[in-house]
Interface confidence: low
């Protein structure tokens, strides 16, 4: 094949290189570009930056490599439009520094940055950890820092992400209140920060106020949804990112819901409950206290993590027809308290007789092995009737 | 020249408090850790805490913690330590010293605030 | 913490002596400093990252040593040597010193 006079050359069949001495100072308008998995960049001393834009519609490029240039600066967002990135080189260039942001995402196999002069600070901490962890083949390449020695040996004492503390409302949140929340942030060069409110949708009217280092979140006019609903601050330094969720515990009375029961395992009450604070329950049988016991007990469904709603059953193990009957359940806390009840039959009384039966008329006191599979009631021996009044 | 200069000697009760200043001059005040170390009579060289003056992110060393309030002034470029709750074994020479990030050394030290504390 | 143990405690040397001061760390430090310290004065700093002259401070002061052992030399005592030597560690958090080795005057 003839030699490639252009700036860049195919190789391969989805790969470009681009070795003539000073022929490029960016990255757009690449021939081929959509298709290109391997890109190979050499002795361009007029790149210096590496932008956003540079990289869009490489979607699909895995193995990048610009080495012996002039790149002076990676965007913390240059990578973005190359989420399958897995190799990339930058060795030799003029880096000073590299964002954490600038490799979050991607799931890099390789980085290479040696022969860069880079600068020992806080923000090469996610880098360091790497070599710690021996990650993407850095501790390989012993990297040093101008000036300074080896990036394994900075001290990081002082390297930490943001430290948040969000401040919620001590006092009780009833609906329809509005909610201040502020969130602190601690830390050295901080960049960013903010709310993630995702989770609330139409749990209250939203508005954010201040900035770094003190941001605030006002909550208007708050639901009950709002409940168990995170509310997230978050913070980034050159370090790297933290958040901090947070849940607003919105009071409202407690509610109840009993369905029919069903037979499962177990005879099983279903119910539903609601109410913030959890409300405390009783159970009622015909209306007296239901003492529960290993028999008749109340056991919860495992809660939804977004929701204050609890649902459970009244557990019957093996009931007859003296669990038949008005099951009421209370459900109280400081705000309210609700009952429901609800008619049960697990088992007809076999004692409860219907006029137009047969009646029968005696119990010999000489039958005393029953062999209906009905109960035989006996007292003593002497021989009784049984009179029935048809009224 | 890069210089930092401690306020004077004090002299406490036990359960009282005492707030020690540190001027600096001679370079940017908030790029750089300032870190505070004392030294009981007799005794070796003790870390207290450091702050960084641009953002007064602050941590000490666990033995301090609740008691002592590190602080930084960017208008007159004065960091301060406050300690509280002072007992006896709280009398020593406070010394501030800046943190030189390019080679990773306290450089700069300040002459010292001997401060006391009788009953 | 890193603790930071220095031998010997004291010292007596002449004038023209060489002196050996030994620092170890109780887990593995990347770099060493040291610092000399006079009576009423501030420390002050002689040697950073185990082997590099703090500004002002003559060659006959020199540092080696790694991972937990290190090493002061002065190579020719001089009068105003007399003092007392700290070794220090900033690799991990926090910062620890050493308990001081004091040099007199034998």
């Known amino acids: 094949a003839a030699p490639c006079p252009d700036a860049c050359c195919p190789h391969g069949s989805s790969g470009l290189r681009c070795t003539r001495d000073g022929a490029l100072d960016s990255l757009h308008h690449l021939p081929g570009a959509e298709n290109l998995t391997e890109l190979y960049i050499e002795n361009q001393q007029h790149l210096q930056h590496l932008e956003l834009r540079d990289l869009r519609g490489l979607g699909e490029l895995r193995n990048l490599t610009i080495v012996k240039s002039g790149l002076r600066f990676v965007a913390p967002d240059a990578f973005h439009f190359t989420p399958r990135l897995s190799r990339l080189n930058l060795s030799f260039n003029a880096l000073e520094s590299l964002s954490w942001k600038t490799v979050q995402g991607l799931s890099l196999q390789e980085l290479v940055l040696s022969g860069n002069p880079l600068h020992c600070s806080c923000a090469l901490r996610w880098l360091q950890r790497w070599e710690e962890e021996g990650l993407g083949g850095v501790p390989e390449q012993k990297l040093q820092c101008h000036g300074q020695g080896p990036l394994a040996h900075m001290p990081n004492a002082s390297c930490g992400v943001p430290t948040l503390k969000v401040q919620v409302p001590n006092a009780s949140v009833d609906v329809g209140d509005d909610v201040l929340l502020r969130c602190q942030v601690e830390g050295r060069g901080l960049e960013q920060a903010g709310w993630i409110l995702t989770e609330l949708e139409q749990s209250a009217t939203v508005m954010k106020s201040g900035g770094l280092p003190s941001l605030g979140l006002t909550l208007a006019n708050v639901t009950s949804d709002l409940n168990r609903k995170n509310v997230t601050c978050w913070a980034e330094n050159d370090v790297g990112r933290a958040e901090v969720s947070v849940q607003v515990n919105v009071s409202f009375p407690a509610s109840v819901q009993l369905h029919t029961a069903v037979e499962m395992h177990h005879w099983c009450i279903p119910f539903s409950v609601d109410g913030q604070p959890a409300p405390s329950l009783r159970w009622l049988f015909n209306g007296s206290v239901l003492n529960e016991t290993s028999f008749i007990f109340t056991e919860f469904l495992e809660p939804a993590a977004n929701e204050t709603v609890r649902h459970g059953c009244l557990r019957l193990n093996q009931p007859t027809h003296v669990n038949n009957g008005n099951y009421t359940l209370l459900a109280a806390n400081p705000f309210g308290q609700a009952s429901a009840s609800i008619m049960a039959a697990f088992m007809d009384n076999p004692f409860e007789f219907n006029p137009e039966d047969p009646i029968p008329v005696s119990f010999s006191p000489v039958d005393t092995n029953s062999t209906s599979g009905d109960p035989v009631e006996k007292k003593d021996e002497t021989p009784f009737g049984v009179s029935v009044a048809v009224g | 020249q890069v210089q930092l200069v401690q306020s004077g000697a004090e002299v406490k009760k036990p359960g009282a408090s005492v707030k020690v200043s540190c001027k600096a001059s001679g370079y940017t005040f908030t790029t750089y850790w300032m870190h505070w170390v004392r030294q009981a009579p007799g005794q070796g060289l003790e870390w207290i805490g450091t702050?960084?003056?641009?953002?007064?992110?602050?941590s000490n060393a666990q033995k301090f913690q609740g008691r002592v309030t590190l602080t930084a002034d960017t208008s007159t470029s004065t960091a301060y330590m406050e300690l509280s709750s002072l007992r006896s074994e709280d009398t020593a020479v406070y010394y501030c010293?800046?943190?030189?990030?390019?080679?990773?050394?306290?450089?700069?030290w300040g002459q010292g605030t001997t401060v006391t504390v009788s009953s | 913490d890193i603790q930071m143990t220095q031998s010997p405690s004291s010292l007596s040397a002449s004038v023209g002596d060489r002196v050996t001061i030994t620092c170890r760390a109780s887990s593995s430090v990347s770099y060493l400093y040291w610092f000399q310290q006079k009576p009423g004065k501030a420390p002050k700093p002689l040697i950073y990252r185990t082997s590099n002259l703090a500004s002002g401070v003559p060659s006959r002061f020199s540092g080696s040593g790694s991972g937990t052992d290190y090493t002061l030399t002065i190579s020719s005592l001089q009068p105003e040597d007399f003092a007392t030597y700290y070794c220090q560690q900033y690799h991990s958090y926090p910062p620890t010193f050493g308990g001081g080795t004091k040099v007199e005057i034998k």
């Open positions: 010293t800046r943190f030189y990030y390019e080679d990773w050394y306290f450089d700069v």
């Open positions: 702050i960084y003056p641009g953002n007064s992110d602050s």
